[in-house]
């Protein structure tokens, strides 16, 4: 399977609520020992490997944000610790992994990866990410809502084994 | 700190069930697998099975698979483990154990529960 | 089932003096995923195991550094520098890389 990144760019006005979104494609092995842990994380650019390094989201880890369910199945992050930051993870049954944040300040500016790992019989058998920018505008310039911008074809299928 | 409480020793007659329990604290409950372990008097120890709390997706040794049951209560932060056709060979003390992970990946057990001796007698 | 054995069973040593124990496994332990996941644990006398040493030589936190376990495929060894007083029990080692995972039947270190 695939990580593929809608947006590559999400521009946003200091406290609008953002989703940042990425969709597992290809093939998902739906047998009933497997499973796919899923997460998000900040990262830099400039690295040699784009989301190599593992930041958290406003003092959250990928950790605490992470999601394991079935290939089939739909979940997102019920626990108050997410909620309380204002940060909410979750996975549909189409195979799209999003993380919500609201109230969003300057602070939140950066990149934003997500992380898909198929477990089977609690083993890590393939992983992929996909990174995205966010881009948090305050003053005249700034957008009254969030701007998205498309990934060109090549990024939007971000095949990247971690 | 990471604690794993396990309830206390059992009597049971062969043919019953007995439900052992795990409670958990100290770490975020739905993030660590938990895994039973026994030991039989005076043996060594037997990987069981285990049970992710998050989804209770649960991997069973097929020697207890027909007699063995893992379930866990989010609300309360406790795993369960039922072993039911209770013969005198199941008569052991059984662990709990948490495994550490890395992306879902499992790494090791890292700690363990007190220990519940459970007797099979007539 | 994959069958771990150990070797000795039974391990007298005079403290300060090295110790080490073999595991062998009846086929590879190396998971389709590149890992070995091998573990050490140490039950001490009336007490639950404790993880001493996880994917084969990576020691976990809070464990002295006389402690170091090596091998690959089938063979590992679980090596004490200067065996303490302390290090007493039953050492086991154990493969969580195919199901069911298994023990290995275990090693009695005693003090001479």
């Known amino acids: 399977f695939k990580v593929a990144t809608p947006y590559s760019l999400y521009v946003c006005p200091e406290g609008q609520n953002v989703t940042l979104t990425c969709r597992l494609l290809g093939p998902v092995d739906k047998g009933h020992d497997v499973t796919f842990y899923k997460t998000w994380y900040r990262s830099s650019r400039g690295e040699v490997q784009t989301c190599s390094e593992r930041r958290p989201i406003r003092n959250l880890t990928f950790q605490d944000l992470h999601l394991h369910h079935g290939g089939h199945q739909a979940a997102n992050t019920s626990h108050d610790l997410a909620q309380r930051h204002g940060l909410e993870s979750a996975s549909d049954h189409h195979g799209n992994f999003s993380i919500t944040m609201r109230n969003l300040t300057l602070l939140d500016s950066g990149l934003y990866c997500c992380l898909v790992v198929e477990i089977r019989h609690h083993h890590s058998e393939h992983r992929v990410h996909g990174a995205m920018e966010l881009q948090v505008q305050t003053g005249k310039d700034a957008p009254s809502n969030c701007v998205v911008y498309p990934s060109s074809s090549q990024d939007s299928e971000n095949i990247t084994a971690a | 700190q990471v604690q794993l409480v396990q309830s206390g020793a059992e009597v049971k007659k062969p043919g019953a069930s007995v439900k052992v329990s795990c409670k958990a604290s100290?770490?975020?409950?739905?993030?660590?697998?938990i895994h039973w372990v026994r030991q039989a008097p005076g043996q060594g120890l037997e990987w069981m099975g285990e049970?992710?709390?998050?989804?209770?997706?649960?991997n069973y040794n097929e020697k207890f698979r027909n007699r063995v049951t893992m379930t866990r209560d989010t609300s309360t932060s406790t795993v369960y483990m039922e072993l039911s056709s209770l013969r005198s060979e199941d008569t052991a003390v059984y662990y709990c154990?948490?495994?550490?992970?890395?992306?879902?990946?499992?790494?090791?057990?890292?700690?363990w529960g007190q220990g519940t001796l459970v007797t099979v007698s007539s | 089932d994959i069958v771990m054995t150990q070797s000795p069973l039974s391990l007298p040593v005079t403290p300060g003096e090295p110790a080490s124990i073999s595991c062998r496994s009846t086929?590879?332990?190396?998971?389709?995923?590149?890992?070995?996941?091998l573990e050490w644990y140490l039950q001490k006398p009336g007490q639950s195991p404790q993880l001493l040493i996880y994917?084969?030589?990576n020691r976990f936190s809070g464990v002295p550094d006389r402690f170091s376990g090596s091998g690959s495929g089938t063979d590992f060894t679980l090596k004490i520098s200067r065996v303490e007083a302390e290090d007493v029990g039953v050492y086991y080692c154990?493969?969580?890389?195919?199901?069911?995972?298994?023990f290995g039947q275990g090693t009695k270190l005693e003090i001479k």
């Open positions: 154990a948490r495994s550490y992970d890395y992306d879902g990946d499992y790494y090791a057990m890292d700690y």
């Open positions: 049970i992710n709390p998050s989804n209770g997706l649960t």
């Open positions: 100290g770490y975020t409950f739905t993030s660590y697998w």
């Open positions: 086929q590879s332990i190396v998971h389709s995923n590149g890992n070995t996941y």
């Open positions: 154990f493969q969580a890389s195919h199901v069911p995972w298994t």
């Open positions: 994917k084969v030589s």
